[in-house]
């Protein structure tokens, strides 16, 4: 999916009202310095495909954040404001439901999603010169 | 304007089946989660799940041990809960609420279903 | 499963008095995940205020709402007689969601 065509400034909106306070949920406990930000982004597209990949494809480890609450804010802030995004998500989504663990937060996940928070402050902050 | 119409009034034998339909319009069907709520007579509210259209993701709520399907076809923009095995505690208004991000961006059941009363009777 | 616990049951007011409703949560939530919901006799429930304290579209300014971590409260500074209803707090911080068991705001 091309997230060119996004209202990012919405998206941005409901990530700072309430999806970032699930990803803090989520994380509570862990120090912010536990781990280091691999993954980074250019542009808010370019940032939005990153997050969409982390939050919803199951990766060696962590099969299992597409069922958190800040995946169900997320999905819906990018099908209401990115348009065509929900039609192209039918068979990513099947084929995960296929393959879908029981719901365990491991130490990859909370790696994952600490990734997820960087790529989120990443896309908050489009004018700043990549590191 | 969204709204949610809500199929009538059912009676049922228990043991048997259920199934509501939550018609919508006025909205992008596909784009927003479609929960389903209950409510026994003089009792509060309780979530049962909810479904996202766009690829028919769910998310169920465990009380009701598998006995809750929802479904949706995007064909009519209409979400479906099915209730299985039912028992006279489940006589209840049923309830479908689209689920959004209001004008503050709080994600919240900002439209409501207008109710389905199911009652449970030998 | 966050437990919401709605005090009082029953909250008997007369028209123009202060009426203070409480939500308490079993876990700490963020408070942009607390909504308050209105319902009348024989309706559906209705959005009344956003994240603790944002009001719905159309919602008198003598609602209030604030709180935080496990500690809410809706208030209605001045008690009209269309705000004679039963009102529910609901969570959005985590599966399964969850509602108080509803505060009736009744005639005095």
């Known amino acids: 999916y091309d997230f060119t065509n996004c209202d990012f400034e919405k998206i941005k909106a409901a990530y700072l009202s309430t999806i970032s306070k699930d990803l803090i949920t989520y994380m509570s406990g862990t120090k912010s310095t536990e781990f280091n930000n691999t993954v980074s982004c250019s542009n808010r597209p370019h940032c939005l495909t990153e997050i969409q990949s982390l939050t919803f494809n199951p990766t060696a480890g962590c099969a299992s954040l597409a069922k958190e609450m800040f995946a169900m804010k997320t999905k819906a802030a990018l099908a209401i404001w990115c348009p065509g995004y929900s039609e192209t998500q039918i068979n990513a989504t099947q084929a995960m439901k296929k393959r879908r663990k029981r719901k365990v937060t491991t130490n990859k996940c909370l790696e994952q999603v600490s990734q997820l928070q960087g790529l989120w402050r990443r896309f908050n902050r489009p004018l700043l010169k990549q590191q | 304007q969204v709204q949610l119409v809500q199929s009538g009034a059912e009676v049922k034998k228990p043991g048997s089946s259920v199934k509501v339909s939550c018609k919508s319009s006025?909205?992008?069907?596909?784009?927003?989660?479609i929960n389903w709520v209950r409510q026994a007579p003089g009792q509060g509210l309780e979530w049962m799940g909810q479904?996202?259209?766009?690829?028919?993701?769910?998310t169920y709520n465990g009380n009701f041990k598998g006995r809750v399907t929802i479904t949706a076809d995007k064909s009519t923009s209409t979400a479906y809960m099915e209730l299985s095995s039912l028992r006279s505690e489940d006589t209840a208004v049923y309830y479908c609420?689209?689920?959004?991000?209001?004008?503050?961006?709080?994600?919240?059941?900002?439209?409501w279903g207008q109710g389905t009363t199911v009652t449970v009777s030998s | 499963e966050i437990v919401m616990t709605q005090s009082p049951a029953t909250l008997s007011v007369s028209p123009g008095e202060r009426a203070t409703l409480s939500c308490s949560v079993s876990?700490?939530?963020?408070?942009?995940?607390l909504h308050w919901y209105q319902q009348k006799p024989g309706q559906s429930p209705r959005p009344w205020i956003f994240?603790?304290?944002n009001l719905a579209s159309g919602i008198p300014a003598r609602f209030s709402g604030s709180g935080s971590g496990t500690e809410f409260t809706l208030t209605i500074s001045s008690l009209q007689s269309e705000d004679f209803a039963v009102y529910y707090c609901?969570?959005?911080?985590?599966?399964?969601?969850?509602f108080g068991g509803g505060t009736k705001v009744e005639i005095k």
């Open positions: 006025g909205y992008a069907f596909s784009s927003y989660w």
């Open positions: 479904i996202f259209p766009g690829d028919g993701d769910t």
């Open positions: 609901q969570q959005w911080s985590s599966y399964p969601l969850t």
């Open positions: 609420a689209r689920s959004g991000f209001d004008y503050g961006y709080f994600y919240a059941m900002d439209y």
């Open positions: 994240g603790t304290s």
């Open positions: 876990s700490s939530i963020s408070s942009s995940n």
